[in-house]
Amino acid sequence: VPRWRQQWSGPGTTKRFPETVLARCVKYTEIHPEMRHVDCQSVWDAFKGAFISKHPCNITEEDYQPLMKLGTQTVPCNKILLWSRIKDLAHQFTQVQRDMFTLEDTLLGYLADDLTWCGEFNTSKINYQSCPDWRKDCSNNPVSVFWKTVSRRFAEAACDVVHVMLNGSRSKIFDKNSTFGSVEVHNLQPEKVQTLEAWVIHGGREDSRDLCQDPTIKELESIISKRNIQFSCKNIYRPDKFLQCVKNPEDSSCTSEI
């Protein structure tokens, strides 16, 4: 008799998930000498231990603690770039501006970026068919809890001036329900963080509006100010030119506003 399997609303585990995690770990530790000491086999074992044989709606931050411990990494606390709904540009930026870091530039963020995973209660199987959707099924699923955990730790580590890249093309430029809005904003430490500087990325070529005056940005400013952290905001009118100028700051066209 075939065993009944829970059907979730979200996509199943990414194909070749264990191999992907291990290979990404190997690749990362080869590129980053400060992480050479990391045993990637142990990292996989800890990752697996967080969700295998557990109900995929019953995952806790505690489940990920062994993995967090193995992936402990010191990034310069004043070089942190947060982002919301504009991941690709944030990553393109840190690929050029090598001294700044997004969460996905750290080992744990790099391991899990774009992946989906979940197990099944009481079996050692990985579920490649479906995984819980945050909205339709449950919020305490393996993927959501992982990102909540690493995002909280990343925000807690930040200091001095913290930058955040926001998508100016969205109806809610700042969304309280995003990971940035629900986790990272509330875990910046006022005793360490002096300023949160938002970079609002414009989508349209001819869009000259000051999106720093957007009501959702004002809402973000209010939340941040109440936490005794200063807030500043910049419009990035031309993201393509912005990246070009990060690559070639001495270019004569880079003195004008971008």
């Epitope: 990414t14 194909k15 070749r16 264990p18 191999e19 992907t20 291990l22 290979a23 990404r24 770990c25 190997v26 690749k27 990637c40 086999q41 996989w44 970026d113 774009d114 992946l115």
Partner: antibody, heavy 123, light 111 residues
Framework: QVQLVQSGAEVKKPGSSVKVSCKSS????????INWVRQAPGQGLEWMGR????????ESAQKFQNRVTITADTSINTAYMELSSLRSEDTAVYYC????????????????WGRGTLVTVSS | QSVLTQPASVSGSPGQSITISCTGT?????????VSWYQQLPGTAPKVLSY???HRPSGVPDRFSGSKSGTSASLAISGLQSEDEADYYC???????????FGTGTKVTVL
């Protein structure tokens, strides 16, 4: 610097078997996915199969499924490809290649190759 | 064993640009799978030039660039040099065969 070091050339009789080795030097084989690819003289590349030592899993192309055995001994950092019931068409250079992840999820490619082992099947 | 189709040979003069095509099906190149490209110099093992359709490993000159559209992929080589004389292969995972498929190979000659 990781290298894949392969065993030397072999001459085999039709109907016999050959076992080619691939040693990971400077890196832990257990952490890699090792593939086997062959190339007949003057021909293109043909994928035979792969092994993921840390999962203890191997798979092979349908064409070779009954004749190829891919194994690994992680204690000596070595992967093996054994091909049985050899025929003259199996004369080829056999490469081991490390498979690694690409830029996005579910994306893989061969980033490191051994120098190849020439296997000649002749009566 | 299904293979991806490439032109048998492509040639160009030094400094010129050439493009090598790689045509597959909906289960390999056209699927949610990625194309990688390999250069094989005479008597040596293949070496990766491009992966994830359009990414270049470090150490590979930016004269080489990969791209993909639909069920086809291509490798462009600009500023052709004599050391580019080699065989070039594309590769992709085939979901229906459950194995990697390589291109038929293209011999590049620098005139």
């Amino acid at each position: 610097q990781v290298q894949l070091v392969q065993s030397g050339a072999e001459v085999k009789k039709p109907g016999s078997s050959v076992k080619v080795s691939c040693k990971s030097s400077g890196g832990t084989l257990r952490n890699y996915v090792i593939n086997w690819v062959r190339q007949a003289p003057g021909q293109g590349l043909e994928w035979m199969g792969r092994i993921t030592p840390f999962l203890g899993e191997s798979e092979s192309a349908q064409k070779f499924q009954n004749r190829v055995t891919i194994t690994a001994d992680t204690s000596i950092n070595t992967a093996y490809m054994e091909l049985s019931s050899l025929r003259s068409e199996d004369t080829a250079v056999y490469y081991c290649a490390r498979e690694t992840v690409g830029a996005t999820a579910a994306d893989w490619y061969f980033d490191l190759w051994g120098r190849g082992t020439l296997v000649t099947v002749s009566s | 064993q299904s293979v991806l189709t490439q032109p048998a040979s492509v040639s160009g003069s030094p400094g010129q640009s050439i493009t090598i095509s790689c045509t597959g099906t909906s289960s390999d190149v056209g699927a949610y799978n990625y194309v990688s490209w390999y250069q094989q110099l005479p008597g040596t093992a293949p070496k990766v030039l491009s992966y994830s359709n359009d990414h270049r490993p470090s150490g590979v000159p930016d004269r080489f660039s990969g791209s993909k559209s639909g069920t086809s992929a291509s490798l462009a080589i600009s500023g052709l040099q004599s050391e580019d004389e080699a065989d070039y292969y594309c590769a992709a995972w085939d979901d229906s065969l459950n194995n990697y498929v390589f291109g038929t190979g293209t011999k590049v000659t620098v005139l």
